[in-house]
């Protein structure tokens, strides 16, 4: 289950309106749901950005967001929210979603540079994308929601636009 916009634990908290919010906004007076990409930190008494803790060992509250963020950083992969998995575009080029358009169209234009899995796929082999051993470098407390995403090359603005669209 996604930790986005949900409390990591129960409880209610008063918010002092006159203070500057760590997120620049307060979101009501009882325990609240937070905007996308934030989570409720009851000890701090406010919504906090998930981005700050994605590299920290404790990302239970933002597990889905952090997996998605790490996945987006890796060229040629995208995060599928339904599957809750980091998908290799190379494994689905040809019937790819728009998130892979940039990767697949570029790769198809230059077959010399195709990765082995795509070369196999084009010659009729099917890649088993479930084996992602050694690819994850995230939380030591990730539990059952561990992601195969590996922080890697940053996406360009155009690529990010595709990922976020």
């Amino acid at each position: 289950m996604s930790g986005l916009g949900r409390s990591r634990r129960g409880g209610r908290s008063r918010v002092d309106q006159e203070e500057r919010s760590p997120q620049g906004l307060w979101t009501g007076v009882a325990m609240r749901s937070c905007p996308e990409e934030q989570y409720w930190d009851p000890l701090l008494g406010t919504c906090m950005s998930c981005k700050a803790i994605c590299n920290h060992q404790s990302q239970r509250t933002c597990a889905t967001f952090c997996r998605s963020l790490n996945c987006r950083k890796e060229q040629g992969r995208f995060y599928d929210h339904l599957l809750r998995d980091c998908i290799s575009c190379a494994s689905i080029c040809g019937q790819h979603p728009k998130q892979c358009a940039y990767f697949c169209e570029n790769k198809l234009r230059s077959p010399v540079n195709l990765p082995p899995e795509l070369r196999r796929q084009r010659s009729g082999e099917v890649e088993n994308n479930s084996d992602n051993s050694g690819r994850y470098q995230g939380s030591e407390h990730r539990g059952s929601e561990a992601s195969p995403a590996l922080p890697g090359l940053k996406l360009s603005a155009d690529q990010l636009a595709l990922v976020y669209s």
Partner: antibody, heavy 118, light 107 residues
């Protein structure tokens, strides 16, 4: 390794202000919340408030509203805690402490003794 | 605010003794209970987070247990460097609050 180094002891007169610094190293400064904790001589620990250096967001304990102001300087990875209108009640050791995102304060500065005396 | 009550406020023990300190929260704090050790003139040091997880570098003779409102810190065999004051702290609800401390002295 993570280190929080605070400024030295201060002696102030009643009514004055004091600004204590806490310089962080060994981690990404903007990724963690910094808290301040007060300890009067021979007494326990009292939470004062926190600052998120990422965007200078702050939140203070009700007791310290109007008394404390927390700021940060990203260029030097330093947070500051300023106390105004000092009285003898403000005589204490002040600690900065990093929040570990799981409800604990995992690293602490060495403390700064502020003495208010006429 | 959540009140944290530690007991005893002080205790005398000898090297090698098993020592138990308790902390009670005024309301349910799940497992978000931390323990700190403080020596005179020094800053507190995190010993235990989330009730029973030892902080890096903390000896295994320290252990924690409990859930909800009642928690304990146990030192299985007291060593000379363990004579100090111990504080519990709840991390479940704003604002964070500390127990009054337990001073462990040499008998």
């Amino acid at each position: 390794q993570v280190q929080l180094v605070q400024s030295g002891a201060e002696v102030k007169k009643p009514g004055a202000s004091v600004k204590v610094s806490c310089k962080a190293s060994g981690y990404t400064f903007t990724n963690y919340v910094m808290h301040w904790v007060k300890q009067k001589p021979g007494q326990g620990l009292e939470w004062m408030g926190y600052i998120l250096p990422y965007n200078d967001g702050t939140k203070y304990a009700q007791k310290f509203q109007g008394k404390v102001t927390m700021t940060s300087d990203k260029s030097t990875s330093t947070v500051y805690m300023e106390l105004s209108s000092l009285t003898s009640e403000d005589t204490a050791v002040y600690y900065c402490a990093r929040y570990d995102w799981e409800g604990s304060f995992d690293y602490w500065g060495q403390g700064t003794l502020v003495t208010v005396s006429s | 605010d959540i009140q944290m009550t530690q007991s005893p406020s002080s205790l005398s023990a000898s090297v090698g003794d098993r020592v138990t300190i308790t902390c009670r929260a005024s309301q349910d704090i799940s497992n978000y209970l931390s323990w700190y050790q403080q020596k005179p003139g020094k800053a507190p040091k995190l010993l235990m987070r989330y009730t029973s997880r030892l902080h890096s570098g903390v000896p295994s003779r320290f252990s924690g247990s409990g859930s909800g409102t009642d928690f304990t810190l146990t030192i299985s065999s007291l060593e000379q460097e363990d004579f100090a004051t111990y504080y519990c702290q709840q991390g479940n609800l704003f604002p964070p609050t500390f127990g009054g401390g337990t001073k462990v002295e040499i008998k």
